[in-house]
Amino acid sequence: IWELKKDVYVVELDWYPDAPGEMVVLTCDTPEEDGITWTLDQSSEVLGSGKTLTIQVKEFGDAGQYTCHKGGEVLSHSLLLLHKKEDGIWSTDILKDQKEPKNKTFLRCEAKNYSGRFTCWWLTTISTDLTFSVKSSRGSSDPQGVTCGAATLSAERVRGDNKEYEYSVECQEDSACPAAEESLPIEVMVDAVHKLKYENYTSSFFIRDIIKPDPPKNLQLKPLKNSRQVEVSWEYPDTWSTPHSYFSLTFCVQVQGKSKREKKDRVFTDKTSATVICRKNASISVRAQDRYYSSSWSEWASVPCS
Amino acid sequence: VPGGSSPAWTQCQQLSQKLCTLAWSAHPLVGHMDLREEGDEETTNDVPHIQCGDGCDPQGLRDNSQFCLQRIHQGLIFYEKLLGSDIFTGEPSLLPDSPVGQLHASLLGLSQLLQPEGHHWETQQIPSLSPSQPWQRLLLRFKILRSLQAFVAVAARVFAHGAATLSP
């Protein structure tokens, strides 16, 4: 058993049929010695008396808010949550496996630049009685500070018969060094509590590996005289690290016909313009990627050819 | 470059960008076997990293690029020695189309651009490598190339910025 926060405790249980469970001793936070009784949740049934209460925690029915009283007055509470371990593996019932970029990916994180700011998100089908708490650091043995905000519900989607809820959190490294080569990864830890179930999820990454620039901005077409060609131009996204002579992007320009089956013409360039042939009913799209490190491409910025 | 003269920024920029491309193309082609995360000991912890105080940020380069260039040179020599070690020259043999050989030569080429014959910076950090067991090598190669990708990305940014802003 360990303390998650004040008056909230997590009991770690091996979860299998007829498991013996864990013996837990609760102590009432009071100077009083006599006349103390214990109850669980809203029940008025007295579970025991005395300053300490010893219970055998085997299942969710044994978890909940234990309260010690004296003469009708509440002295203190202890909330017991369960953390299940099945076949040596901690349960992951609360969050959905996003399966990207690999199986058992529950947390996904992205950064728009090298400033040390990043966003993580996760999915669940649970809509109520759900709380999250997020901590982060750079490295684990001698951790350096990363400050995370509160996790918030950022999207709701309908997937077949189910509703899916996306939560996200923003974090900022306290002393970021955008130009340095990271040697210690960022660690992100999410505590999830659903009713009386506790789970924790972790992710470890370098900012460089989660970079995904915003799409190029101000995408424009300029027809070239007496030609089917156009000059496409764009600019670095505002959110990208500066100076651009140091934090350089590379770009992919794509001409795509109306039909998805039509052949796509693609051009790669380090410049912020390119000359392409604009077909009727086609659209021109441009996306960006770090020039020197193959992290994710941005989403496409698009304009119609006409 | 030792002694304070300027490097050939544009040549360094071109070669460092080529190094980035090679490091990424070499990464999946490090051997004939499936990579298993056997023996996941931290073996690449001792590689030289370009750290915050090394002056490789735009301001540091403007103030005095020598600190940064020396750090990059140390890293290039270190990785060049790693790529020539039995981790890469021993079994499992590299795939026939592996660009590790080209990568190795380019690391040497860039380090020579930074330190021409007869000029010397202080003693380099040399990899202390006991011969690795063959079964460890795929994972070691994988980790070394991952680490090299990060190192050459910073070096390429330095040379690109230098070519754009510090070239005579």
């Epitope: - | 004939h32 076997m33 298993r36 056997e38 020695k81 020539g84 070690s85 039995d86 020259t89 021993g90 079994e91 499992p92 043999s93 050989g101 190795h104 490598l129 011969p131 067991q133 063959p134 079964w135």
Partner: antibody, heavy 115, light 107 residues
Framework: EVQLQQSGPEVVKPGASVKMSCKAS????????IHWVKQKAGQGLEWIGY????????KYNEKFKGKATLTSDRSSSTAYMELSSLTSEDSAVYYC????????WGQGTLVTVSA | DIVMTQSPATLSVTPGDRVSLSCRAS??????LHWYQQKSHESPRLLIK???QSISGIPSRFSGSGSGSDFTLSINSVEPEDVGVYYC?????????FGSGTKLEIK
């Protein structure tokens, strides 16, 4: 085409030393280790060790430490093995090979130790 | 050191037979096992690497299987030119060790 050309047969007296060579061609000499393997007449194969011509790093089978010394000369793309304090037990064919998971072996050097 | 044990020591076969040669390692070597063929007065020739990977120029009748500590070299239709001694080799850890060989002869 990759080739490993070994030096010719040697007849040596007990207690003497012998140095044999393995000249590599058709590839970058420093890009691969070179192993040495012993085979006594009518018997199996025994791994002696390898040299990495890039940095002259060596790895020996404990059994051959003090018996075999591996060296290389990058200028001539040649690997060498010297065997010292020879006895009749050292009479064998010695092969050089470029990585044991590749199909490149020298033709072997026969060493005969005889008074 | 890892000990490689080959069986049988000798195998007499008829051309066209399918044969299996066995090799056992004294501890797990994953798939780090190579097979060689050596004909009389010739250098060894690599047949199979990493337990099952084929080698360019080696006839397709030769195949390998196994992982951990038990390995098999199969020749699915023996030809008269397949006579010789077949060795397996531990390529997992130093010192590299070879099996004592299986001699294949034609009846």
């Amino acid at each position: 085409e990759v080739q490993l050309q070994q030096s010719g047969p040697e007849v040596v007296k007990p207690g003497a030393s012998v140095k044999m060579s393995c000249k590599a061609s058709g590839y970058t000499f420093t890009s691969s280790v070179i192993h040495w393997v012993k085979q006594k007449a009518g018997q199996g194969l025994e791994w002696i060790g390898y040299i990495n011509p890039y940095n002259d790093g060596t790895k020996y089978n404990e059994k051959f430490k003090g018996k075999a010394t591996l060296t290389s000369d990058r200028s001539s793309s040649t690997a060498y093995m010297e065997l010292s304090s020879l006895t009749s037990e050292d009479s064998a064919v010695y092969y050089c090979t470029r990585r044991l998971d590749e199909a490149y072996w020298g033709q072997g050097t026969l060493v005969t130790v005889s008074a | 050191d890892i000990v490689m044990t080959q069986s049988p020591a000798t195998l007499s076969v008829t051309p066209g037979d399918r044969v299996s040669l066995s090799c056992r390692a004294s501890q797990s070597i994953s798939e780090y096992l190579h097979w060689y063929q050596q004909k009389s007065h010739e250098s060894p020739r690599l047949l199979i690497k990493y337990a099952s990977q084929s080698i360019s120029g080696i006839p397709s009748r030769f195949s390998g299987s196994g992982s951990g500590s038990d390995f098999t070299l199969s020749i699915n239709s023996v030809e008269p030119e397949d006579v010789g001694v077949y060795y397996c080799q531990n390529g997992h850890s130093f010192p590299f060790t070879f099996g004592s060989g299986t001699k294949l002869e034609i009846k």
